[in-house]
């Protein structure tokens, strides 16, 4: 009986027309929903004139529905046996969901003050843009809403840059009607041990962000993995958001209406510096902000992101040294509520059940010739917000699973 | 739009001092670093100095430090250049320039002659 | 200190003529050089920026380019008001400094 379940299995884990797992690969079945926290600076001018710690107060729920798209441009290459395609970008906001509304305000980092001081650091140009800061009436923060902030905004002080810079700026900006990839990944047909196992992204096996090991594309993306998952295995699995490979280990057994999943969770080791960690050396991009890289969960992301000084973390600064969450006062880390996990059905190797949880933060630095970035007498990586983007398996489709899958090896 | 009022001359005796101005006025004063620069007559543009108006914090060129010293008077949105222990060598023009797009606004220019 | 070289100080030129003032750095300054035009009596006037940007209102027959250590001013359909003194100047590093200018007259 065992072997007629494996090969069905087989059969109908291959991401090609007319098996169970296309058909919820190419459109996810389950709602997935992402919902967002802001950090709402409250002392923003005792920061800018005292270098003072960053006082946050968290703002959220604000909830949005994603990736409710099909896959677009999916198309088979049988020489290979891999399948490529485009994963579009959509958000809906959810008001039931959510504490207020899209024009709620918040008082946050100046995104646009925070890059341009960092990516244009000759004294002479730092000096042009603060006469610009101040010609637009921007400072070290600003207010925006909360559309502004994630989907963009048109910035007054880069619009008066007279160099040729996109203008608007937004945390997430540019998301609807933007697709991630191209993915390849391997359909399986060949050797089910591959499935979904990401070939190629944008055309290359690796990223051109990070030194050797760090740069190469693992895994898959998390969404499924090849059937027949074991306890001890470590789990690679890519993200664009984050700009790299990543890992999930075992942690527990969990019930999930009626089927038994293994929950993978992101380990505290992933985010340890090179000192804990050896194999982390190469996601140490910097001396500087990284004390020589000792500090730890927190991951420079700016080559990914033009040059701005994007830094990820998980929310709160869960699993961070304490140099980093030291300057700003509000934060309270814990493993429940913050940290990553992936519920995954180890027969098929679908993830019936995630909660992805990441923190986008941006470093500012003082600037002799910028007026508002003047009295700084420290660098901060400024938390402006925290996702949890999650999706669990609908009660119709646990049932069809516990009948078609579970059910027939139990 | 931006203007600088520089006194257009300057007579100055050997080893005596002298305080250079310049008004500004069509912009904010203390929002833009203010530079100065020397031309002497026949010859290239040296740079001095530049000063922030909104704290007086300055930076100079080696050369010209302990021979000039930038200061502002915020309440009359004016900069000022002293010049101390004068010598022929200081004789020339000397502008100044607040950074806006770049060094893209000049005073006219204060000609300083040192002489007996 | 970072010295720029105009090696010519002296071009003779003709209305309608394109002509090409040269400036050398003594090393690697990126983009960070301006250009500026200067006649008798007056105060420079910036033409150039990061290299290769016009100022507004500078006519596009100002054309800066270059990289580095070599830089070029070219103006294409030289007019008369063009007869003047000019300057290059680097921001890559302090302190600031300036070419010792070119001066366009006419044949």
């Known amino acids: 009986g065992d072997l007629l379940i494996q090969k069905t299995i087989k059969k109908q884990v291959v991401l090609e027309e007319g098996t169970i797992a296309f058909k919820n690969w190419v459109k996810t079945g389950t709602e997935v929903y992402r919902q967002f926290w802001i950090f709402d600076v409250q002392n923003p001018q005792e920061v800018m004139m005292n270098s003072s710690n960053i006082q946050v107060k968290q703002r959220g729920p604000y909830t949005y529905r994603v990736r409710f798209l099909a896959k677009e441009n999916v198309t088979q290459d049988a020489e290979d046996n891999t399948v490529s395609f485009l994963q579009p970008n959509g958000a809906i906001f959810e008001p039931s969901l959510s504490v207020g509304t899209e024009a709620d305000n918040f008082t946050v980092l100046n995104l646009a003050v925070a890059a341009a001081s960092h990516i244009y650091q000759n004294q002479f140009v730092q000096m042009i843009l603060n006469s610009l800061i101040n010609k637009s009436k921007s400072s070290m923060f600003q207010v925006r809403t909360l559309r502004e902030l994630l989907w963009g905004y048109r910035d007054p002080f880069l619009s008066l840059v007279p160099y040729p810079v996109t203008t608007t700026v937004g945390l997430f900006y540019p998301y609807n009607n933007t697709a991630d990839g191209v993915y390849k990944v391997f359909n399986g047909k060949d050797n089910i041990s591959k499935v979904a196992i990401i070939d190629t992204y944008k055309g290359k096996r690796n990223l051109s962000y990070w030194e050797s090991h760090c740069d190469m594309i693992n895994g898959t993306d998390a969404a499924s993995f090849p059937p027949f998952v074991e306890k001890s295995q470590v789990l690679q699995f890519f993200s664009s958001d984050i700009c790299r490979s990543i890992y999930a280990v075992f942690e527990s057994d969990v019930n999930l209406k009626g089927i038994p999943v293994y929950r993978f969770v992101l380990p505290s080791k992933a985010f340890a510096s090179p000192v804990e960690n050896p194999d982390n050396y190469c996601f140490c991009t910097e001396k500087i902000i990284s004390k020589n890289c000792t500090s730890y969960g927190v991951l420079d992301i700016s080559k990914c992101k033009e040059g701005r000084p994007v830094y990820i973390s998980l929310p709160h600064f869960l699993y961070a040294s304490p140099d980093v969450s030291e300057p700003i006062d509000g934060l309270n880390p814990n493993e429940e509520e913050h940290r990553t996990y992936l519920d995954i059905e180890p027969i098929t190797g679908f993830t019936l059940q995630f909660a992805k949880r990441l923190q986008v933060n941006l470093l500012v630095k003082p600037s002799e010739k910028i007026q508002v970035l003047k009295n700084l007498k420290r660098n901060y990586i400024v938390p402006i917000l925290w996702l949890n983007e999650t999706g669990t398996i609908g009660d119709e489709k646990a049932n069809m699973f516990r009948s078609q899958v579970t059910g027939k090896i139990n | 739009q931006v203007q600088l009022q520089q006194p257009g001359a300057e007579l100055v005796k050997p080893g005596a001092s002298v305080k250079l101005s310049c008004k500004a006025s069509?912009?904010?004063?203390?929002?833009?670093?203010m530079h100065w620069v020397k031309q002497r007559p026949g010859q290239g543009l040296e740079w001095i100095g530049e000063?922030?108006?909104?704290?007086?914090?300055?930076n100079y060129n080696q050369k010209f430090k302990g021979k000039a010293t930038l200061t502002v008077d915020k309440s009359s949105s004016t900069a000022y250049m002293q010049l101390s222990s004068l010598t022929s060598e200081d004789s020339a023009v000397y502008y100044c320039?607040?950074?806006?797009?770049?060094?893209?606004?000049w005073g006219q220019g204060t000609t300083l002659t040192v002489s007996s | 200190d970072i010295v720029l070289t105009q090696s010519q100080k002296f071009m003779s030129t003709s209305v309608g003529d394109r002509v090409s003032v040269t400036c050398k750095a003594s090393?690697?300054?990126?983009?960070?050089v301006a250009w500026y035009q200067q006649k008798p009596g007056q105060s420079p006037k910036a033409l150039i920026y990061s290299a290769s940007y016009r100022y507004s209102g500078v006519p596009d027959r100002f054309t800066g380019s270059g990289s580095g250590t070599d830089f070029t001013l070219t103006i294409s359909n030289v007019q008369s008001e063009d007869l003047a003194e000019y300057f290059c100047?680097?921001?890559?590093?302090?302190?600031?400094?300036f070419g010792a200018g070119t001066k366009l007259e006419l044949k």
């Open positions: 320039a607040p950074i806006h797009y770049g060094l893209d606004n």
């Open positions: 100047q680097q921001y890559n590093s302090y302190p600031l400094t």
């Open positions: 090393q690697n300054v990126g983009t960070n």
């Open positions: 069509g912009y904010t004063f203390t929002s833009y670093w």
């Open positions: 000063i922030d108006p909104s704290d007086s914090h300055a």
